[in-house]
């Protein structure tokens, strides 16, 4: 039976060029984490964070998506086009899997705010 | 050039164990993982496991759990698999492949493996 | 485990023509699907990565397609030098899996 829950950083906003953490946090099971999945709004896959083998950046991403904090994911040098749904998947034993959604709204103002729902250190 | 040079067949009885080796050059070892895929006769392609070079990692795949072992020598840029306890149906060519994390950009020239009695 | 399941078994396509191989996975795999072609005697070759990312040296006739559950394999134009089987495999999650492999002809 899955009894986890993911809490995630909700509906955040951040300025155009800069930077964003995207968190999710499972919590509720002992479940153990054998992998997280980052994807985007059109299925493309940003990241992977595998227990055993460590962190993948997806090759179309990696000059601009960094690993972490924890098992976040930190989205770089943000343009118009990133606007849109981010999708964390655990993949855990034995649960099975667990998907979060965060909703990422990049804004040409410059008084954007990134505000997170809460904040892993 | 890339390249991922594999040892020879090997012919094995029931119960034996096979150490198949995977010599890598032409790229820095322990940036990419090592997988390792069989394929049996007249059958589709299996992932048994894969290894971080750089970190020691490993994952296998389940029903191969206690029965596959893979290792990686960063001195040698080598990586080995070995397979125990070995049964007709394990009968296969065993690949090597550099994994640019879980797909598979150069592969081994693969070794077959014959259990026979 | 994710079950891939590639249609059809076998395909023959006359010099020239459009060649599709479809692939089906059991569960969500975004865009993690790869695919592989393999001629007799020798390895497997990196065709498509991550649905639809070509890879490095591979002819434009080969495109990939698709996202979630369903993908996409199309040959454009086939070429002698094409005859092989090709295999999707998912690269989503652990263990990794392949498609049982379509074997393409020369009608």
């Known amino acids: 039976m899955m009894t986890g829950t993911i809490e995630t950083t909700g509906n955040i906003s951040a300025k155009k060029g800069g930077s964003v953490i995207l968190q999710c946090h499972l919590s509720s099971t002992m479940a153990q984490v054998t992998q997280v999945n980052w994807e985007q709004h059109d299925h493309s896959l940003l990241a992977i964070r595998n227990a055993e083998l460590g962190w993948h950046i997806y090759p179309a991403f990696k000059d601009r998506v960094a690993p972490g904090p924890g098992l976040g994911l930190t989205l770089q040098s943000l343009t118009m086009n990133d606007t849109g749904e981010y999708f964390c998947t655990y993949h855990t034993y034995p649960d099975g899997t667990y998907r979060g959604r965060i909703f990422l709204e990049v804004l040409e103002s410059s008084v954007a705010e990134h505000s997170a729902r809460f904040q892993i250190p | 050039e890339v390249q991922l040079v594999q040892s020879g067949a090997e012919v094995k009885k029931p119960g034996a164990s096979v150490k198949v080796s995977c010599k890598a050059s032409?790229?820095?070892?322990?940036?990419?993982?090592i997988e390792w895929v069989r394929q049996a006769p007249g059958q589709r392609l299996e992932w048994m496991g894969v290894i971080n070079p750089g970190s020691g990692g490993t994952n296998y795949k389940e029903k191969f759990k206690g029965r596959v072992t893979i290792t990686a020598d960063k001195s040698s840029s080598t990586a080995y698999m070995e397979l125990s306890s070995l049964r007709s149906e394990d009968t296969a060519v065993y690949y090597c492949a550099r994994g640019e994390y879980f797909f598979f950009d150069y592969w081994g020239q693969g070794t077959t493996v014959t259990v026979s009695s | 485990d994710i079950v891939m399941t590639q249609s059809p078994d076998s395909l023959a396509v006359s010099l020239g023509e459009r060649a599709t191989i479809n692939c089906k996975a059991s569960q969500h795999v975004s865009q993690g699907v790869a695919w592989y072609q393999h001629k007799p005697g020798q390895s497997p070759k990196l065709l498509i990565y991550?649905?639809?990312y070509r890879y490095t040296g591979v002819p434009d006739r080969f495109s990939g397609s698709g996202s979630g559950t369903d993908f996409t394999l199309t040959i454009s134009s086939l070429q002698a030098e094409d005859v092989a089987v090709y295999y999707c495999?998912?690269?989503?999650?652990?263990?990794?899996?392949f498609g049982g492999g379509t074997k393409v002809e020369i009608k």
């Open positions: 032409g790229y820095a070892f322990t940036n990419y993982l």
């Open positions: 495999q998912q690269h989503y999650n652990t263990p990794h899996t």
């Open positions: 991550s649905a639809s």
